[in-house]
């Protein structure tokens, strides 16, 4: 079992992964999976890792990239982590308006909005 | 029925119309709503709109402050549109490779990471 | 745990800037659940509230001390801090920094802080 | 702005029970935290929305709330429980924070 590695250091190792065993992965030419036509990443995160599982049972497993699946296994228990942490703390109105006041500022400014 | 603006522009007024009945909304003040702890947004949006739900409930309706629900009811109806998105395109390995690569890339930049 | 510690100086001049920094450890300064927030304490009195900040950058000040008090938060640093300008002898108090939820769930210990010539 | 009020000392004999006040207008409609703060040290919550205490806080502590009136009971009050009590709502108005001026309890003896 690994030491448990940072999040963020688990991400950069994954995307080096990822580069290492591209030609492996993409060698199932009539394979298709589901691909997100928008960029707002984080509304896919299902989709995308039922992706991932499809790819990983297709993928011949040994060496690394059994690494690669690993990994993005963690992610995805971080991210249902992060998920199950958006209704823990129940706070006040006033609160829950400066949290939805951020998110669409935020939508407002970094989401990529087609009309 | 009024005609339909960008998303865009409907997030702006948005917020305008929140800042305007803060006071309206604050005014309940033994309510609770639950509020993500973290400031990725997007993983949190069936939170988000339950919350809004809720308050919608326990707002006295009329005037303005019904736009601004309306308003939010079209933001959902967006979002809800753009989830749909996430799985209907079925796309070559490549393409996903592409699409993940880029998903953990972002998250890698932009998202905020507590170990 | 979360845990707060306040640093800065313990003495002020009359009519200067009283500056105050509070470190969060133990989580996130960016946690939505939680405002960061300033009091202070006059000896031998009750606590007054100074304001508070969210992570987006929202402050909301008490009104006797709104025109001389700032807060601001920087998340990189996982700090928020207190800024209170021309101050006198009656601005001498322990200054807490607190995280505030539907009440102040965690404090620092305080520092006292003290003007004078 | 909000104003709370609190009487500036009561004190009581050891196994007595304490009752300490917060009154403000229509008080009731708003929920009440109390805090104790021992000399040389930071607050702690020992009630919050009323009348529910945070893990840790002994059964001793209550509180109630109704009118214009709050108030904090602490029952076979020990000598440990002596401290300042602070009380605490939101100005919902304002968003504002309030305090109570603090109520300095004495255990006799």
């Known amino acids: 079992i690994p030491t448990e590695i940072p999040t963020s250091a688990l991400v950069k190792e994954t995307l080096a992964l990822l580069s290492t065993h591209r030609t492996l992965l993409i060698a199932n030419e009539t394979l298709r999976i589901p691909v997100p036509v928008h960029k707002n990443h984080q509304l896919c995160t299902e989709e995308i890792f039922q992706g991932i599982g499809t790819l990983e049972s297709q993928t011949v497993q040994g060496g690394t990239v059994e690494r690669l699946f690993k990994n993005l296994s963690l992610i995805k228990k971080y991210i249902d982590g992060q998920k199950k942490k958006c209704g823990e703390e129940r706070r006040r109105v006033n609160q829950f308006l400066d949290y939805l006041q951020e998110f669409l500022g935020v939508m407002n400014t970094e989401w990529i909005i087609e009309s | 029925i009024p005609t339909e603006i960008p998303t865009s522009a409907l997030v702006k007024e948005t917020l305008a119309l929140l800042s305007t009945h803060r006071t309206l909304l604050i005014a309940n003040e033994t309510l609770r709503i639950p509020v993500p702890v973290h400031k990725n947004h997007q993983l949190c949006t069936e939170e988000i709109f339950q919350g809004i739900g809720t308050l919608e409930s326990q707002t006295v309706q009329g005037g303005t402050v019904e736009r601004l629900f309306k308003n939010l009811s079209l933001i959902k109806k967006y979002i809800d549109g753009q989830k749909k998105k996430c799985g209907e395109e079925r796309r070559r390995v490549n393409q996903f490779l592409d699409y993940l690569q880029e998903f953990l890339g972002v998250m890698n930049t932009e998202w905020i990471i507590e170990s | 745990q979360v845990q707060l510690q306040e640093s800065g100086p313990g003495l002020v001049k009359p009519s200067q800037t009283l500056s105050l920094t509070c470190t969060v450890s133990g989580g996130s300064i960016s946690n939505g659940a939680y405002y960061w927030s300033w009091i202070r304490q006059h000896p031998g009195k009750g606590l007054e509230w100074i304001g508070y900040i969210y992570y987006s950058g929202s402050t909301y000040y008490n009104p006797s001390l709104k025109s001389r008090v700032t807060i601001s938060v920087d998340t990189s640093k996982n700090q928020f801090s207190l800024k209170l300008s021309s101050v006198t002898a009656a601005d001498t108090a322990v200054y807490y920094c607190a995280s505030l939820g539907n009440w102040f769930d965690y404090w620092g210990q305080g520092t006292l802080v003290t003007v004078s010539s | 702005s909000y104003v709370l009020t609190q009487p500036p000392s009561v004190s009581v004999a050891p196994g007595q029970t304490a009752r300490i006040t917060c009154g403000g207008n229509?008080?009731?409609?708003?929920?009440v935290y109390w805090y104790q703060q021992k000399p040389g040290q930071a607050p702690v919550l020992v009630v919050h929305d009323d009348s529910d205490r945070p893990s840790g806080i002994p059964e001793r502590f209550s509180g109630s709330n109704s009118g214009n009136t709050a108030t904090l009971t602490i029952s076979r009050v020990e000598v440990g429980d002596e401290a300042d009590y602070s009380c605490q709502v939101w100005d919902s108005s304002s968003d504002h924070v309030v305090f109570g001026g603090g109520t300095k309890l004495t255990v006799l003896g």
């Open positions: 229509n008080i009731g409609s708003k929920n």
